[in-house]
Interface confidence: medium
């Protein structure tokens, strides 16, 4: 018979042969042969694999470093990674929760929509057209662009979400 060019779901092709993938929580020890099944072994105590796989090494569980304000929210299993969260009153700096902040700052181009409270983090919003923020701040809202017209000036440089407009004198036609 012709050797296969594709395999079923939860199988992989090796040496012109379809072998079973290892189930989540197990790693590959040896590929199948004509006569033997794929050999898999369970991941160790602090390891995991979360997909059907042919990995020869399991991944280490994430470490929730208390020096970064992290603690374990959900202990990892052989099939799932550890989930970290922040100590009481602190907030994750990202979805992955790799470090903690008392309250998050809004980057330039973003302003504070709602200042943090004891239970909720800072809420940021993008500065709309006509507004800017040039600082990283946990408190400052987007500021409106300077109105050159009210100062009897003209716009020399357009504003952005991160910079104010630059005003300059009007060009006066000489008589």
């Amino acid at each position: 018979p012709e050797p296969p060019t594709a395999c079923r779901e939860k199988q992989y092709l090796i040496n012109s042969q379809c072998c079973s993938l290892c189930q989540p929580g197990q790693k590959l020890v040896s590929d199948c042969t004509e006569f033997t099944e794929t050999e898999c072994l369970p991941c160790g105590e602090s390891e995991f694999l979360d997909t059907w796989n042919r990995e020869t090494h399991c991944h280490q569980h994430k470490y929730c470093d208390p020096n970064l304000g992290l603690r374990v929210q959900q202990k990892g299993t052989s099939e799932t990674d550890t989930i970290c969260t922040c100590e009481e009153g602190w907030h994750c700096t990202s979805e992955a929760c790799e470090s903690c902040v008392l309250h998050r700052s809004c980057s330039p181009g973003f302003g504070v929509k709602q200042i943090a409270t004891g239970v909720s983090d800072t809420i940021c919003e993008p500065c709309p057209v006509g507004f800017f923020s040039n600082v990283s701040s946990a408190f400052e809202k987007c500021h409106p662009w300077t109105s050159c017209e009210t100062k009897d000036l003209v716009v020399q440089q357009a504003g952005t979400n991160k910079t104010d407009v630059v005003c300059g004198p009007q060009d006066r036609l000489r008589a």
Partner: nanobody, 116 residues
């Protein structure tokens, strides 16, 4: 190397006043929003007040609004916290902070005890 050194704490009676200072070095002071936070005995960290880099905008926790005043002198790289009408619940170690990341640069703090 970033350094923050708080001073001015001490024992004061309820209703009294204190002025805390924080001497900063190792970074461009006026570029940063600066903060005061405190930790009461056996409690978590509580944010107290913040001030913009240029010193024009100030922010306060509800618990200290109207009693505390934050200010800064960028020419001296120093942050201040004027505390008036002090109460027993203001007893805490006060820290100035450059940013509020858990592992970021914090001073060692200065202890304020409000007691009769």
């Amino acid at each position: 190397e970033v350094q923050l050194l708080e001073s001015g704490g001490g024992l004061v009676q309820p209703g009294g006043s204190l002025r805390l200072s924080c001497a900063a070095s190792g970074f461009t002071f006026e570029w940063y929003e600066m903060q005061w936070v405190r930790r009461a005995p056996g409690k978590g960290l509580e944010w107290v007040s913040a001030i913009s880099g240029d010193g024009y905008r100030t922010y306060y926790a509800d618990s200290v609004k109207g009693r505390f005043t934050i200010s800064r002198d960028n020419s001296k790289n120093t942050l201040y916290l004027q505390m008036n009408s002090l109460r027993a619940e203001d007893t805490a170690v006060y820290y100035c902070a450059k940013e509020l990341l858990f592992f970021d640069y914090w001073g060692r703090g200065t202890l304020v005890t409000v007691s009769s």
